[in-house]
């Protein structure tokens, strides 16, 4: 910008140096040069001389008018053409900005990642404002009525140490900039209901050499939460459609899940968990890729029709990736495909 130049006159903006995008704007230049009666006053925007909509108001002052100014930022300066001077003489300059008042923050969500010591709140900010916009996060105890405020730019982490006096809170976010202020809807939060278990990790997988080969996936978490509900999704790397298996997990020991999969295929697995009965999920774990061994017999195993898929307190369903480039963003395409029962003679899955 050019906010620190020495002016030989003045430059001002109507309605102001920061204004709503799309407004009509007038920029005035008034010279106060010694030993100069300017022949002309010129305006420059971002270093380029302007040719149109310039009005000479009087001997010392000129105005440029912009219809529907829509650039987020511009730097303006004006100069004088003084008789006997080869170069134009600088009068003054200003940084100008246009933007929007903020949208009301939406989809406010607060979670506590286990062991983090923080409550993390996020929200959608809406359309870009193009100007400095801050978010004031209000956290009000429903038990003590005490209210705390936090300043944020896109999300906030609030130490759980500062949330000791209460379990129930009302949280809302104000979006503020110089053009306006909007409030989010209020979110009722119970600290015990928003804990997301410590990350679940797939540690390894192996395929047995049985007559009907099976793949065992080993996965774990450091969570201290006793009742945890998990989903594992899996697909071949060439496929768009995921199968999802559901589990009630107990992480006092490593989980083992058995799958009957296509032989000689590369599969990707991911797992995520939530506290049973709660609504906040972990993000999907990092993709774990496993190559199944080559087929010894001729049988082609279909993972969703095989009687050998273990189905103890599990559900298998199919989901399809919206984009092969975004494996984390999936859309449920079907209801549960089937809820199976353990095939006779097969051990049940742990959890």
């Amino acid at each position: 910008g050019i906010t620190s130049i020495n002016c030989s006159g003045d430059m001002w903006v109507e309605p102001g140096e920061i204004f709503q995008m799309g407004m009509n704007v007038s920029i005035y230049c008034q010279e106060a040069l010694k030993h100069c009666r300017p022949r002309n006053l010129y305006f420059y925007k971002n270093g380029f001389k302007e040719e149109f909509d310039i009005t000479r108001i009087n001997r010392t002052t000129a105005r440029i008018w912009y219809k529907g100014f829509s650039e987020p930022h511009a730097y303006m300066h004006c100069t004088a053409e003084c008789p006997g001077h080869f170069q134009e003489t600088l009068i003054c300059g200003k940084d100008i900005s246009s933007g929007h008042p903020p949208d009301a923050p939406s989809n406010l969500t607060c979670v506590i990642y286990e062991y983090s010591g923080n409550m993390t709140c996020t929200w959608n900010t809406g359309k870009p404002t193009y100007i400095d916009t801050k978010y004031i996060v209000h956290v009000k105890s429903l038990e003590t009525e005490e209210e705390q405020q936090y300043l944020a730019s896109s999300y906030v982490k609030i130490s759980t140490d500062s949330l000791q006096g209460s379990r129930k809170y009302l949280v809302w976010v104000q979006a503020v900039n110089s053009l306006g202020m909007e409030n989010s809807q209020q979110l009722h939060v119970h600290l015990d209901d928003i804990v997301i278990p410590s990350a679940s990790i797939i540690s390894r997988a192996e395929t047995t050499n049985d007559t009907v080969p099976k793949t065992i996936v080993y996965w774990k978490s450091k969570t201290m939460i006793e009742k945890v509900f998990c989903e594992m999704r899996y697909k071949t790397t060439t496929n768009q459609t995921w199968s999802v298996k559901e589990f009630d997990a107990n992480f006092t020991y490593v989980q083992q899940s058995e799958f009957y999969l296509e032989p000689d295929s590369k599969y990707v697995f991911q797992v995520r968990c939530q506290e049973t009965g709660k609504r906040n999920w972990q993000p999907w774990s990092s993709p774990f890729v496993h190559q199944t061994s080559q087929e010894t017999g001729k049988r082609n195993w279909q993972p969703w029709s095989s009687p050998f898929v273990h189905q103890t307190s599990q559900t298998v369903s199919q989901v399809t990736a919206k984009s092969s480039h975004e494996p984390q963003k999936m859309e449920m395409l079907s209801a549960t495909i089937f809820r199976g029962h353990p095939a006779s003679g097969n051990h049940q899955d742990i959890g």
Epitope: D132, Q149, L151, K157, S162, S178
Partner: nanobody, 116 residues
Framework: QVQLQESGGGSVQAGGSLRLSCTAS????????MGWYRQAPGKERELVSM???????FYADSVKGRFTFSQENAKNTVYLQMNSLKPEDTAMYYC??????????WGQGTQVTVSS
């Protein structure tokens, strides 16, 4: 620890003016986003005015055109010039220092009472 001290409150007739001051001590004044807030009896604390890093200022609709936020960086002080005061401006006025991600720090407040 950040300390903020407000002054300049008082009682005034409707239509009158007051100038509130807030001086900050023992911290890096420049790291704060400074704001003026007010709390009327039985109501939530509300933001009145806040200055932004780009030099722009927010004013609540109820005070636009009547209140002016200014600051004197050399003195670590911010001001709220309040003109054309109305009875509904009666409240405890607080200045606040907010840094990103941290809990907003308040001063003790200064009472403004506007009678009709």
């Amino acid at each position: 620890q950040v300390q903020l001290q407000e002054s300049g409150g008082g009682s005034v007739q409707a239509g009158g003016s007051l100038r509130l001051s807030c001086t900050a001590s023992r911290y890096t004044y420049s790291s704060c986003t400074m704001g003026w807030y007010r709390q009327a009896p039985g109501k939530e604390r509300e933001l009145v005015s806040m200055v932004f890093s780009d030099g722009s200022t927010f004013y609540a609709d109820s005070v636009k055109g009547r209140f002016t936020f200014s600051q004197e960086n050399a003195k670590n002080t911010v001001y709220l010039q309040m003109n054309s005061l109305k009875p509904e401006d009666t409240a405890m006025y607080y200045c606040g220092c907010a840094t990103l991600g941290s809990r907003t720090i308040w001063g003790q407040g200064t009472q403004v009472t506007v009678s009709s």
